[in-house]
């Protein structure tokens, strides 16, 4: 039922207290532990307008907001350079690598009519190459990138046109890979999508202050999430026998003080009105959350008894990201009588409470340094040691169903707002030079160690 | 500025008809929800009708359910109430008024509703045969 | 529907002295969800529309003096002036906004001794 992540902040004696034996966790994550690595497709792709490929929403904000970049270009230039992409995932040893598709790459202007060949042929190839590796592709259908041409014809995901488009997209996705793809995405953490895209101005298309367009934007992304999966669950699973979800992404919040109720309740507010967004109507009642619908009653889109039928229950597992990108701006956090924190764990926690125990698989975690530090990442690695700390208390001590990790990123890349003034990746690219060559951090070392023992050896 | 003008009341009989207008300007119209609140002369304030950002939910007081509707013309950055079947007691002067919201731009949402926040100068209604 | 009582009906007041005025709900407006309380003040002053003074209990309103407060509990609300200065003539209202159809309070008059 929602409302019992509330607990978390009370210490409710259920949720195992972190004493100090606990502080540090020596164990082995369960048998068959999902290890992976993530990249998206405007991050590290580059190539953004070649052989044929159309230009998204962020190609077009980096040239008219971002005035000190010059394109994606720069990039890691995984296009081009997609074996050394491979050469980094076999370094690593991981068990799945995360991707995202350029829906522009495919179809330059958004509409599904002939792929673009080179894109297809891209995307292809990459899949082959997994599968020949036993490297397990999860695709994610829209991390962020959507066609331009959909931006200026139809005002975005402002216009609840776009759920048909996105729907004929995923479906020939479904038909081109879904032989190779047993796990797939349909949309990047849409809260940053709606709330810094049509809220902030910080992320595309760039609009500022429109508090209706941020939840007509929401909404629709919910509904084109839910369209996806019943249209997969429908005419795909059957024979693909994949699974399909959305990556959820929130920060974490604590009380300033944990015996005042008051604080509790803005704490609770706070992942409602970030994660609980989209995560109830997904994974809860098929609704908004009844906070969200008594705060914003006549800017809020309203969900039929229908649409609440069919939102619900519309994902195979829980994709959750937790990373920096959900934690800033962080100015606004002393007001409300809370400090962010980045305690993984009782996310974590909450979701279990909130979402009657789902599995879990952390779609997106890690850190960021900056843009100066080469290989010798030592602020990754203790922010890697951290979260994986973490994550593994919250499976052994508090019986979370978490099944598999995505560290991000696999390379260094275009970071979105932030652009090339921070590093994410475990492998250092510069991107000055003309062969781009992955170098392994001191992080990347870290991780190949975790994932060949499976955890943390005494 | 940020305005409200009510227009489009007058005298009118029982059982008859009238359409209530209140024109927007100087702020983005279409994102916010809009109410009617009326007054009967030397009464209090009774809320009479919302309507969300977009047209696409509505609801009303008891009194008016019915006989009532509220709609909106985003294009025209224009609200209104149809009144039919009006009696001697919907005699009142009628307010628009904006719903606001905290704009909590530089940080997560936190939403704190700010209550009707922009109200127009009223039209007055006299129902009387 | 919920019904809110104000009390007193008639306050009569003088400048520079202090004033509070009370509004009681036939219900909580306690939100069990979110632990906000969702009652506003309006002021109506003489031959003026309405005005919004305090939302969500204790909010104060963009432009609002400090001198006005808000504060109660679930069922029980107060409207504070610290220092009544000739221009806070008028009529109050509280209003609730927990569930449909909103509902005001009755009004207080506030006026000048």
């Known amino acids: 039922f929602s409302g019992d992540g509330r607990a978390i902040w009370s210490k409710n004696p259920n949720f195992t207290p972190v004493n100090e034996s606990q502080l540090f966790l020596y164990d082995t994550f369960p048998k068959n532990f999902f290890w992976g690595i993530g990249t998206g497709a405007l991050q590290v792709e580059g190539s953004w307008k070649k052989d044929g490929k159309g230009p998204s929403i962020w190609d077009h904000f980096i040239h008219t907001h971002l005035k000190n970049v010059s394109s994606t270009n720069g990039s890691s230039d995984s296009y081009i350079f997609l074996e050394k992409d491979l050469s980094a995932l076999d370094f690593i040893g991981v068990s799945f690598y995360q991707f995202s598709i350029s829906w522009p790459r495919l179809f330059p202007d958004g509409i599904v009519t002939v792929a673009n060949a080179k894109g297809l042929q891209y995307y292809s190839t990459l899949l082959d190459a997994l599968v020949l590796r036993n490297i397990e592709p999860i695709v994610t259908l829209y991390h962020w990138d959507l066609p331009l041409a959909l931006q200026e014809k139809y005002g975005g995901w402002k216009n609840d046109t776009i759920i048909d488009i996105f729907n004929d997209y995923a479906t020939y996705c479904f038909q081109m890979f879904g032989d190779r793809v047993k796990y797939w995405i349909t949309i990047h953490n849409p809260y940053l999508v709606a709330w810094h895209g049509y809220g902030t101005g910080m992320h595309a298309p760039g609009e500022k202050g429109n508090l209706a367009a941020v939840y007509t934007v929401g909404h629709n992304l919910i509904k084109a999430h839910s369209k996806v999966w019943h249209n997969y669950n429908t005419h795909f699973r059957p024979h693909q026998k994949g699974w399909l979800s959305i990556t959820l992404g929130s920060h974490w919040i604590e009380p300033n003080r944990s015996e005042n109720t008051m604080d509790i309740f803005k704490c609770q507010q706070s992942m409602v009105s970030v994660l609980g967004w989209f995560a109830n109507p997904i994974h809860g009642d098929g609704d908004y959350p009844e906070g969200m619908r008594k705060k914003l009653f006549s800017v809020l889109p309203i969900f039929s008894e229908a649409e609440k039928h069919e939102m619900r229950g519309t994902a195979d597992f829980f994709a959750f990201s937790f990373g920096p990108n959900n934690f800033k701006p962080l100015n606004t956090m002393a007001k409300m009588g809370q400090n962010v924190s980045l305690n993984l764990r009782e996310a974590l926690n909450w979701i279990k409470l909130e979402y009657n125990n789902p599995r879990i698989l952390i779609a997106e975690n890690g850190w960021f340094t900056d843009s100066r530090v080469k290989t010798e990442d030592t602020t990754a690695i203790y922010m890697m040691k951290n979260f994986l700390s973490q994550v593994l208390q919250a499976i052994r001590l508090d019986e979370i169903r978490v099944f598999g990790y995505t560290a991000w990123s696999l390379l260094d890349g275009f970071e979105w707002q932030d652009a090339y003034t921070i590093r994410r990746g475990l492998f250092y690219v510069d991107f000055n030079s003309k062969q781009k060559e992955r170098k392994p951090k001191s992080s990347a070392h870290y991780y190949k160690q975790i994932i060949r023992e499976n955890g943390f050896s005494l | 500025q940020v305005q409200l003008v009510e227009s489009g009341g007058g005298v009118v009989q029982p059982g008859r008809s009238l359409r209530l207008s209140c024109a927007a300007s100087?702020?983005?119209?279409?994102?916010?929800?809009m109410h009617w609140v009326r007054q009967a002369p030397g009464k209090g304030l009774e809320w009479v009708a919302v309507?969300?950002?977009?047209?696409?939910?509505?609801y009303y007081a008891d009194s008016v359910k019915g006989r009532f509707t509220i709609s909106r013309d985003n294009s025209k950055n224009t609200l209104y109430l149809q009144m039919n079947s009006l009696r001697a007691e919907d005699t009142a002067v009628f307010y628009c008024?904006?719903?606001?919201?905290?704009?909590?731009?530089?940080?997560?949402?936190?939403?704190?509703?700010?209550?009707?926040?922009?109200w127009g100068q009223g039209t007055t209604v006299t129902v009387s045969s | 529907d919920i019904v809110l009582t104000q009390t007193p009906l008639s306050l009569p007041v003088t400048p520079g002295e202090p004033a509070s005025i009370s509004c009681r709900s036939s219900?909580?407006?306690?939100?069990?969800?979110?632990?906000?309380?969702?009652l506003d003040w309006y002021l109506q002053k003489p031959g003026q529309s309405p005005q919004l003074l305090i939302y969500?209990?204790?909010y104060r309103a963009s432009g609002v003096p400090d001198r006005f407060s808000g504060s109660g509990s679930g069922t029980d609300f107060t409207l504070k002036i610290s220092r009544v200065e000739a221009e806070d003539v008028g009529v109050y209202y509280c209003?609730?906004?927990?569930?449909?159809?909103?509902?005001f309070g009755g009004g207080t008059k506030v006026e000048i001794k």
């Open positions: 219900q909580s407006l306690l939100d069990s969800d979110d632990g906000d309380t969702y």
């Open positions: 100087g702020f983005n119209f279409s994102s916010y929800g």
């Open positions: 309507i969300w950002y977009d047209g696409s939910n509505k």
């Open positions: 209003m609730q906004r927990i569930e449909f159809p909103l509902t």
């Open positions: 969500t209990l204790s």
């Open positions: 008024a904006r719903d606001q919201y905290f704009d909590f731009w530089s940080g997560y949402p936190f939403f704190y509703y700010y209550g009707m926040d922009v």
